[in-house]
Interface confidence: medium
């Protein structure tokens, strides 16, 4: 994946100091915490007669640095010390001998905020380009993982759930994936930017929370996404059911009341009984389900319970908090940030006048 350039390029050429030494670089770049950015940069300098065969060294310094005293944040000079806090994260990616001063920043941290200037040295030709400087802005990590559920979840059938952070960059420290779920699970393979969870759901796992947590250790920042599992009950008679799927294989989510009212002349008492039974089972077992951390895709496993925020139990209940089967829709109460998966039974179309909004679990 290409490095993220999160601001339009604001190019500037330095002509104020010495028109023979000039540099083109965007004056401002914004990067989200934990992510990375490549800042294109070109500089020019005349090569005097006495330095034509000398190697070119480039340096990026923090604004206000004193060249003779302070270390650069990045350089191509092998024996030059760099700032400890930027070591391995800031790289002079460009080749100064080709007039390229491009700077790469990975695992961006809050303290990277600030302005930086470039300096070139070629033999006895030395110049600090004090204008334009590069201003780096590190903002909150607002990107969140995507959780992909292929097809529908059925009790007793294993499915591979994928948590991906496609917006992360290849060059950074690989993130640490953690999964939190009450359902029986095991860890599948992982790539740099995704982790697979193998889940074998039970009927009582319907409506329980599943969280994918991604930690960018290089910057010490974490992001997560939580969904509610939609475990679909498939009866013995495949022609009988409620809410047939649209065949898209998408895991649907909805907020608010899940409509489960029964209607239509063709609906039998058996179906109503079936729905009532399922509701009762879910209600009973749901309260017993405790959310547990099922695994981390990293090389540094950690122990300890999930945070208090993650220990909240979600409730699935009817309007009167009884187990009566009146046909009234059960409601879903969750943290505001959660995405809600619908009760999605096979066999019957929902009423057309529903005002419930749908959104895919595969969100931004």
């Amino acid at each position: 994946m290409p490095l993220l350039l999160l601001l339009p390029l604001l190019w500037a050429g330095a002509l104020a100091m010495d028109p023979n030494f000039w540099l083109q670089v965007q004056e401002s770049v914004t990067v989200q915490e934990g992510l990375c950015v490549l800042v294109p940069c070109t500089f020019f300098h005349p090569i005097p007669y006495y330095d034509k065969n000398s190697p070119v060294h480039g340096y990026w310094f923090r604004e206000g640095a004193i060249i003779s005293r302070d270390s650069p944040v990045a350089t191509n000079k092998l024996d030059q010390e760099v700032q400890e806090e930027t070591q391995g994260r800031f790289r002079l990616l460009g080749d100064p001998s080709r007039n390229n001063c491009s700077l790469s920043i990975v695992d961006a941290r809050r303290r990277d905020n600030g302005s930086y200037f470039f300096r070139m040295e070629r033999g006895s030709t030395k110049y600090s380009y004090k204008s334009p400087q590069l201003s780096v802005h590190v903002t909150d990590l607002t990107h969140r993982p995507k959780i992909l559920i292929p097809g529908t979840l059925e009790p007793g059938h294993s499915k591979n759930l994928t948590c991906s952070v496609s917006w992360a960059c290849e060059q950074g420290t690989p993130p640490i994936f953690s999964w939190l779920s009450a359902a029986p699970t095991s860890l599948g393979p992982r790539t740099t930017h995704s982790s697979v969870l193998i889940i074998t759901p039970r009927p009582q796992d319907h409506g329980t929370n599943l969280t994918c947590q991604v930690k960018f250790a290089g910057a010490g920042v974490t992001t997560e996404r939580t969904i509610q599992l939609n475990v679909t009950y498939v009866p013995q008679n495949p022609t009988t059911g409620i809410f047939p799927g649209d065949g898209s294989g998408k895991q649907e989510t909805r907020a608010g009341v899940v409509h489960g009212a029964i209607g239509g002349a063709g609906v039998t008492a058996l179906l109503a009984l079936c729905l009532c039974l399922i509701f009762f089972i879910v209600k009973t077992h749901r309260r017993k389900a405790a959310r547990t951390a099922v695994g981390r895709n990293d090389t540094h496993p950690t122990t300890g319970s999930a945070s208090p925020k993650h220990q909240k139990k979600s409730k699935l209940h009817g309007p009167t908090e009884t187990s009566s089967c009146s046909g009234a829709a059960p409601t879903v109460e969750m943290d505001e940030e959660l995405h809600y998966a619908s009760l999605n039974f096979h066999g019957m179309n929902p009423s057309k006048d529903t005002s419930t909004e749908y959104s895919e679990v595969r969100t931004q």
Partner: antibody, heavy 117, light 111 residues
Framework: QVQLVQSGAEVKKPGASVKISCKAS????????YHWVRQAPGQGLEWIGF????????GYAQKFQHRATLTVDNSTSTAYMELSSLRSEDTAVYYC??????????WGQGTLLTVSS | DIQMTQSPSSLSASVGDRVTITCRAS??????????MHWYQQKPGKAPKLLIK???NLESGVPSRFSGSGSGTDFTLTISSLQPEDLATYYC?????????FGQGTKLEIK
């Protein structure tokens, strides 16, 4: 302001040596190169050589390789040119000039050297 | 060594005239980004003064009637509208390699 002030006129006999000074002020002396250029009466400009104070690098025109010696005293921000084995054809105005990189942006006022028996 | 040949050696022009002085190097003094050619003005009894650096860059404080052009081996100094104070000798100089060398000069007189 930037200034290069050279020592006064010199009259020397053939075979002698002369040392001309060029005192800089108004900027950081060691950030620049110092060149020496001479101009014989009614003639054009002739480059002698240069010195870079920060690392002592020097360069000379082949004609002056063995007769000219360029030095600096960083403590007094002064550049020097010593020319030995003087001949009558060395009679000229000698200029010191400051160079950031390639071109000469400031020049001294010149020092007239007369070599005569 | 790189030889620099200026032409003409001298010229006389009237105030307001457009004046062109050329300088030819015995080998190219241009790289991809820069041409290592500079122009100086020397008035009688004075030290030379930088006019143009890197073939076409006007030194700060120099009147805009002066301009420079060229690359490779052929370079030109132009005075778009000659003024009385432009009476001087003009020199080109390369900085491609050691030794640095100057052209022999072009003496400009005012008619």
């Amino acid at each position: 302001q930037v200034q290069l002030v050279q020592s006064g006129a010199e009259v020397k006999k053939p075979g002698a040596s002369v040392k001309i000074s060029c005192k800089a002020s108004g900027y950081t002396f060691t950030d620049y190169n110092y060149h020496w250029v001479r101009q014989a009466p009614g003639q054009g400009l002739e480059w002698i050589g240069f010195i870079y104070p920060s690392n002592g690098i020097t360069g000379y025109a082949q004609k002056f390789q063995h007769r000219a010696t360029l030095t600096v005293d960083n403590s007094t921000s002064t550049a020097y040119m010593e020319l030995s084995s003087l001949r009558s054809e060395d009679t000229a105005v000698y200029y010191c000039a400051r160079s950031d990189v390639d071109y000469f942006d400031y020049w001294g006022q010149g020092t007239l050297l007369t070599v005569s028996s | 060594d790189i030889q620099m040949t200026q032409s003409p050696s001298s010229l006389s022009a009237s105030v307001g005239d457009r004046v062109t002085i050329t300088c030819r190097a015995s080998q190219s003094v241009s790289a991809s980004t820069y041409s290592y050619m500079h122009w100086y003005q020397q008035k009688p009894g004075k030290a030379p003064k930088l006019l143009i650096k890197y073939a076409s860059n006007l030194e700060s404080g120099v009147p805009s009637r002066f301009s420079g052009s060229g690359s490779g081996t052929d370079f030109t100094l132009t005075i778009s509208s000659l003024q009385p104070e432009d009476l001087a000798t003009y020199y080109c100089q390369h900085s491609w390699e050691i030794p640095l060398t100057f052209g022999q000069g072009t003496k400009l007189e005012i008619k």
